[in-house]
């Protein structure tokens, strides 16, 4: 396994819809063909798996139907979009890039993006 | 090294607005956020609200809300506050602060005066 | 909205003494988003410590943090004669973020 220089923002404040953007950059030291992208969530010392996605180079990431990311990619980075965020998601967002093939394995894993999500004002009741 | 220069002090009448500048240098400007902070006279420090550069989403303190706009220009990487229908408790001094992964605001600006008088 | 309060609002001591001060929160938090903030008169606040413990660079080693959930401490070992200041806690986990009211250390 070697290692590899992942490169993400900072601090990223959701949309007030919960839709949280941010570019994850590698740099990749060969032509890789098969790339795993990995999006792990920090909080409270504990770290859980938000979602993944298996690309070939040239072709779109493709995750889960269920998964709350969506993501496209162009040459060495990948953009990643996490929708459906509330205030409780707030929490550093790591991004964790593999490249699968061809070998050597190469890993590579990001500072974090530190994602603040502030809930929707509710909207006062109205009489109509 | 990392670097935010704020503008000048400003005295303005009640009712008016002001806008304070911080240019920001030694860094990838878009990779953080800039908070604002304030300090009237012989008090502490009062948090107003943060843009994130990234993305240009803003959060402000309700206090502020509708009465504060925070933005930014990536072409010259400086960001900038505005307050407007200006008090006389406005009267402070006005702060801005790199904020970086985990919300810590690491960096400071030297700080802006101004000054609300009739 | 976490509201922070620090205790006490002004601390009497001499160069050479230690310094303990206090800041509780009016609910539990991870102590990853918890700074202490140095503020001399006519200055920005210079951040000391971030994540409850971690010294800032260029920080000396007389500065520590500690604490976890609701009370956090910040101590200064043996107070040289630039520590006397005004010192803030703040905390980043919730929006909106909040600083406490401020701990004053004077010469006794």
């Known amino acids: 396994c070697k290692a590899m220089h992942v490169a993400q923002p900072a601090v990223v404040l959701a949309s007030s819809r919960g839709i949280a953007s941010f570019v994850c950059e590698y740099a990749s030291p060969g032509k890789a063909t098969e790339v795993r992208v990995t999006v792990l969530r920090q909080a409270d010392s504990q770290v859980t798996e938000v979602c993944a996605a298996t690309y070939m180079m040239g072709n779109e990431l493709t995750f889960l139907d269920d998964s709350i990311c969506t993501g496209t990619s162009s040459g060495n980075q990948v953009n990643l979009t996490i929708q459906g965020l509330r205030a409780m998601d707030t929490g550093l967002y790591i991004c964790k890039v593999e490249l699968m093939y061809p070998p050597p394995y190469y890993l590579g894993i990001g500072n974090g993006t530190q994602i603040y999500v502030i809930d929707p004002e509710p909207c006062p009741d109205s009489d109509f | 090294q990392v670097q935010l220069v704020q503008s000048g002090a400003e005295v303005k009448k009640p009712g008016a607005s002001v806008k304070v500048s911080c240019k920001a240098s030694?860094?990838?400007?878009?990779?953080?956020?800039i908070s604002w902070v304030r300090q009237a006279p012989g008090q502490g420090l009062e948090w107003m609200g943060w843009i994130s550069v990234y993305n240009g989403n803003t959060n402000y303190v309700q206090k502020f809300q509708g009465r504060v706009t925070m933005s930014t220009d990536t072409s010259t990487n400086t960001a900038h506050m505005e307050l407007r229908s200006l008090r006389s408790d406005d009267t402070a001094v006005y702060y801005c602060a790199r904020v970086g992964v985990r919300g810590i605001f690491d960096y400071w600006g030297q700080g802006t005066l101004v000054t609300v008088s009739s | 909205e976490i509201v922070m309060t620090q205790s006490p609002a002004t601390l009497s001591l001499s160069p050479g003494e230690r310094a303990t001060l206090s800041c509780r929160a009016s609910?539990?938090?991870?102590?990853?988003?918890l700074s202490w903030f140095q503020q001399k008169p006519g200055q920005a606040p210079r951040l000391l410590i971030s994540g409850a413990s971690t010294r800032a660079t260029g920080i000396p080693a007389r500065f520590s943090g500690s604490g976890s959930g609701t009370d956090f401490t910040l101590t200064i070992s043996s107070l040289q004669p630039e520590d006397f200041a005004v010192y803030y806690c703040q905390q980043v986990y919730n929006l909106p973020w909040t600083f406490g009211q401020g701990t004053k250390v004077e010469i006794k």
């Open positions: 609910q539990s938090f991870s102590s990853s988003y």
């Open positions: 030694g860094y990838t400007f878009t990779n953080y956020g």
